[in-house]
């Protein structure tokens, strides 16, 4: 059974994951982002089901394409580069989903834009956090 300290750690990791996903989304949605139209042409795979931490496997598998799309921003001055954000998200995802069991991700038939994709995983984090508090 999960202890209160392990639940607290999971909650904190989910909150950090949520914050960085929201940060990426905010940067993309910035009305001054000239690359937004191009970014929206890229399609992402969505999970058929995302209700448990093991389903983060589906997010992990899409992190490389996400980084590639974020690289389109090509800002002269990054406080944080796309690879910094994706690297941190990857570390959190690996810790949250665990590596003991191998879960085969099932994807929905319909693909999604980067905005829809990020919103889906933001909702996932919020949903799991709500069950822990």
């Amino acid at each position: 059974a999960p202890t209160s300290s392990s639940t607290k750690k999971t909650q904190l990791q989910l909150e950090h994951l949520l914050l960085d996903l929201q940060m990426i989304l905010n940067g993309i949605n910035n009305y001054k982002n000239p690359k937004l139209t191009r970014m929206l042409t890229f399609k992402f795979y969505m999970p058929k089901k995302a209700t448990e931490l093991k389903h983060l496997q589906c997010l992990e598998e899409e992190l490389k394409p996400l980084e590639e799309v974020l690289n389109l921003a090509q800002s002269k001055n990054f406080h944080l580069r796309p690879r910094d954000l994706i690297s941190n998200i990857n570390v959190i995802v690996l810790e949250l989903k665990g590596s003991e069991t191998t879960f085969m991700c099932e994807y929905a038939d319909e693909t999604a834009t980067i905005v829809e994709f990020l919103n889906r995983w933001i909702t996932f984090c919020q949903s799991i956090i709500s069950t822990l508090t």
């Epitope: 950090h16 914050l19 406080h79 910094d84």
Partner: nanobody, 119 residues
Framework: EVQLVESGGGLVQPGGSLRLSCAAS????????MGWYRQAPGKQRELVAA???????NYADSVKGRFTISRDNAKNTVYLQMNSLKPEDTAVYYC?????????????WGQGTQVTVSS
Amino acid sequence: EVQLVESGGGLVQPGGSLRLSCAASGSIFSINVMGWYRQAPGKQRELVAAISSGGSTNYADSVKGRFTISRDNAKNTVYLQMNSLKPEDTAVYYCMYASSWYEDETDYWGQGTQVTVSS
């Protein structure tokens, strides 16, 4: 409007350590990047290190392995632990608060704190 108050600068010998702190107040959003930039005399301002509220970090190559950035989200405070300081680290260090991972005109900057590394 965001206010940034820096502290911890000073004079230190080569090989020594310093810890900078920067507290943000005002219109703070939970999703942000805080960090440190520096400007040496006659040079352009450059990134030292930055950290997101989610824990993503970025370091300048010149400080990797020597400097560590951390933050306390509850206190809206960012810290820069500087070890093995070198004379070339001498500069004015500016705290930065941004709402996005890339630089834009809505970023906020502190007044700066002087760090001098000299024997």
